[in-house]
């Protein structure tokens, strides 16, 4: 035997309590599938969220972050704040990266800067708080006779995560 | 523009049938869109009679003095919705509205048509 | 569902504040719309979800209750607001959208 349920389509609800007839999903509510016995209610973008797209009776709202901040967990289930370039967050606020260390985003943490003589390189730019280090020709490219090596293009300025 | 235009009115026999249209443009019926039909007789109360489902489901409210006589369909490839009265009477002489029920408005009516006149007279 | 709206019709004065009860024959929650009629014209969306106001209608509008009791206040009547005032029921399902049979306010004198 079919169950009845199973014809209610997506932005509906099998109410129960009404011999199972396929009442709308009432206001600031959801179905997204058909055969729902529910209806979900939608998410609330507020405080630090801000709406991306909003509910309907058939799709969730989606939420971003509002300006300073960025998104974390799965459908920006979190918003974090945005520090500086050359900086992380700690517990204790955005604080500047650690010498030998560099973040070039306004997220994440400070990574260390590449130790160019593992790769038997030179290093050609020196690091600071929001770039890494550029690694040049090696020392042995650069005995007399050796060709002319031509500078490197300046780092790019990076460019934001998604949001 | 965003509208509901209502066709199909007219004067009709007792016992007789009607068809009438309600053609929606600036909007696409939908989940979250029902049209539904609401009638008037001369200086009477609004009477709802039904709404269908705006999406691709043929789920229909009624109103329980409709049955049988009354049916809404809807052809979503013109984006008009019908109301098929058969069996017609003096009582049924109204002003036939089309509205909009939507979800971002409670499933109230925001939007109405301008209503066509059916008069059900020998 | 039954919708009963009272008073059935009332006069006033620009200025006035005034009140109109619906009462459901069962609780339909928050589901409850107020609509403006005048004459010859399609009904105008004032509120829904019971206290919601529709897009551009007055702040003087106002509408509050829950389950069975509904009231729609106007706070300071002005002379557009002379017209037929409907209640709905938004509760959908069969017989669940029925309409109360309006209140009809009119000038005093």
């Known amino acids: 035997l079919q169950d009845p349920c199973s014809n209610c389509p997506a932005g509906t609800f099998c109410d129960n309590n009404r011999n199972q007839i396929c009442s709308p999903c009432p206001p600031n509510s959801f179905s997204s599938a058909g055969g729902q016995r529910t209806c979900d209610i939608c998410r609330q973008c507020k405080g630090v969220f801000r709406t991306r797209k909003e509910c309907s009776s058939t799709s969730n709202a989606e939420c971003d972050c509002t300006p300073g901040f960025h998104c974390l967990g799965a459908g920006c289930s979190m918003c974090e704040q945005d520090c500086k370039q050359g900086q992380e967050l700690t517990k204790k606020g955005c604080k500047d990266c650690c010498f030998g260390t560099f973040n070039d985003q306004k997220r994440g943490i400070c990574r260390p800067w590449t130790n160019c003589s593992l790769d038997g390189k030179s290093v050609l730019v020196n690091g600071t708080k929001e770039r890494d280090v550029v690694c040049g020709p090696s020392p042995a490219d650069l005995s007399p006779g050796a060709s002319s090596v031509t500078p490197p293009a300046p780092a790019r300025e990076p460019g934001h995560s998604p949001q | 523009e965003v509208q509901l235009v209502e066709s199909g009115g007219g004067l009709v026999q007792p016992g007789g049938s009607l068809r009438l249209s309600c053609a929606a443009s600036?909007?696409?019926?939908?989940?979250?869109?029902?049209p539904c039909w609401v009638r008037q007789a001369p200086g009477k109360c609004l009477e709802w009679i039904g709404c269908i489902y705006g999406g691709s489901s043929d789920i229909t409210y009624d109103a329980q003095w409709t049955k049988g006589r009354f049916t809404i369909s809807r052809d979503n490839s013109k984006n008009t919705v019908y109301l098929q009265m058969n069996s017609l009477r003096a009582e049924d002489t109204a002003v036939y509205y089309c509205?909009?029920?939507?979800?971002?408005?409670?499933?109230?009516?925001?939007?109405w048509g301008q209503g066509t006149l059916v008069t059900v007279s020998s | 569902i039954q919708m009963t709206q009272s008073p059935s019709s009332l006069s006033a004065s620009v200025g006035d504040r005034v009140t109109i009860t619906c009462q459901a024959s069962?609780?339909?929650?928050?589901?409850l719309a107020w609509y403006q009629q005048k004459p010859g014209k399609a009904p105008k969306l004032l509120i829904y979800?019971?206290?919601t106001l529709a897009s551009g209608v007055p702040s003087r509008f106002s509408g509050s209750g829950s389950g069975t009791d509904f009231t729609l206040t106007i706070s300071s009547l002005q002379p557009e607001d002379f017209a037929t005032y409907y209640c709905?029921?938004?509760?959908?399902?069969?017989?669940?959208?029925?309409f109360g049979c309006g209140t009809k306010v009119t000038v005093l004198g």
């Open positions: 069962q609780s339909i929650s928050n589901r």
């Open positions: 509205a909009r029920s939507a979800w971002y408005s409670g499933w109230g009516g925001d939007l």
């Open positions: 600036g909007f696409s019926f939908s989940a979250n869109y029902y």
């Open positions: 709905q029921s938004t509760y959908y399902g069969n017989d669940g959208n029925a």
């Open positions: 979800s019971a206290s």
